[in-house]
Amino acid sequence: VPRWRQQWSGPGTTKRFPETVLARCVKYTEIHPEMRHVDCQSVWDAFKGAFISKHPCNITEEDYQPLMKLGTQTVPCNKILLWSRIKDLAHQFTQVQRDMFTLEDTLLGYLADDLTWCGEFNTSKINYQSCPDWRKDCSNNPVSVFWKTVSRRFAEAACDVVHVMLNGSRSKIFDKNSTFGSVEVHNLQPEKVQTLEAWVIHGGREDSRDLCQDPTIKELESIISKRNIQFSCKNIYRPDKFLQCVKNPEDSSCTSEI
């Protein structure tokens, strides 16, 4: 008789999840010499231990502590780029500006990027059929808790000027409910972080509005100012040109506003 299985509203665990995590870990540690000491089998065991045999709506940050410990990595704290709803451009940027880091440029962020996973209470099985959706099912699911944990730690590690890339094409350029708005903003350390500089990325070619005056940006400014962190905002009118100028800063067209 087939055992009854909980049906969740979200997609199930990414196929070949264990193999993907292990392969990514090996690749990352080969590319980053400072992480060569990492034992990827231990990393996978710790990752698995965070959610296997546990109810997928009852995961805590504590469950991920062994993984956090194994994935400990020192990132230059003044070279951190946060992003919200504009991941691809942020990653393109750090691929060019190699001394800056998004969360997904760290080992733990790289391992989990774009993956879904969950287990089942009291069985060692991975659930490939469905996993809890943050809104429809529960917020304390394995994926959400993982990203909340690593995002909090990443923000806590930041110092000096922290940059955040925001999507100017969205109705809420700054969204209080995003990971940036709900976790990272509140975990920047005022004693370490001098300034949060927002880069608002414009979508339309002819969009010349000053999106730094957007009400949601003003809301971000207010939150940051109340935490005694300075705030700065820049419009990136031409993201294509912006990336090009990061690649070739000496280009004569790069002195004008991007």
């Epitope: 020192t74 230059p76 806590e156 590690a157 110092c159 004693e191 370490k192 300034t195 100012s225 700065s232």
Partner: antibody
């Protein structure tokens, strides 16, 4: 290039007030907070606190609360340190220094002498 | 407050030799692997000059003869080789926890 230029030396009598200025240039003033550091003659360095140049919010170290006030005029990219009810022990060189918490940029210092 | 204790209080070094100054913090100044300890040089009548930030990062324009190391509570500034114009006072400073504090200073003289 980035520069912090402070006002000149001051000779004051006990009980008087003094206002030291620190004019910044070469960067966006409101992007970096301004710190104040005191150095008494022949002594070491003491951090007095800082002012958030974006909001104007001052943070004054406990040892300097009361008579020491940080202020700004962002229109001229200038930070100010005002000391009231001056005492002989306030005689020192006062420096402004730009954030973050490690100070790559310093003013040249302002000597405040308190003597009757 | 975090107390920083520098040693020695003074030292005399011959040109071409190595000078080592240590700074001990009363508690750790580390945050996720970054150490919030910095080193300055101050010559008479001048403001301090940043040499090393966050324990081991050489400030732009500072000669590579200066280096910093350490983590947690124990930090070292090394000048190797020492040159005649390195005569100055050297200070460590932490920015891990407000109030920021400085060490009492080390006077370096060249023999």
């Amino acid at each position: 290039q980035i520069q912090l230029v402070q006002s000149g030396s001051e000779l004051k009598k006990p009980g008087a007030s003094v206002k030291v200025s620190c004019k910044a240039s070469g960067y966006t003033f409101t992007n970096y907070g301004m710190n104040w550091v005191r150095q008494a003659p022949g002594q070491g360095l003491e951090w007095m606190g800082w002012i958030n140049t974006y909001t104007g919010e001052p943070t004054v170290a406990d040892d300097f609360k009361g008579r020491f006030v940080f202020s700004l005029d962002t229109s001229v990219s200038t930070a100010y340190l005002q000391i009231s009810s001056l005492k002989a022990e306030d005689t020192a060189v006062y420096y402004c220094a730009r954030n973050p918490g490690w100070f790559a940029y310093w003013g040249q210092g302002t000597l405040v002498t308190v003597s009757s | 407050d975090i107390v920083l204790t520098q040693s020695p209080a003074s030292l005399a070094v011959s040109p071409g030799q190595r000078a080592t100054i240590t700074c001990r913090a009363s508690e750790s100044v580390d945050n996720y692997g970054n150490s919030f300890m910095h080193w300055y040089q101050q010559k008479p009548g001048q403001p301090p000059k940043l040499l090393i930030y966050r324990a081991s990062n050489l400030e732009s324009g500072v000669p590579a003869r200066f280096s910093g190391s350490g983590s947690g509570t124990d930090f070292t500034l090394t000048i190797n080789p020492v040159e005649a114009n390195d005569t100055a006072n050297y200070y460590c400073q932490q920015s891990h926890e407000a109030p920021w504090t400085f060490g009492q200073g080390t006077k370096v003289e060249i023999k």
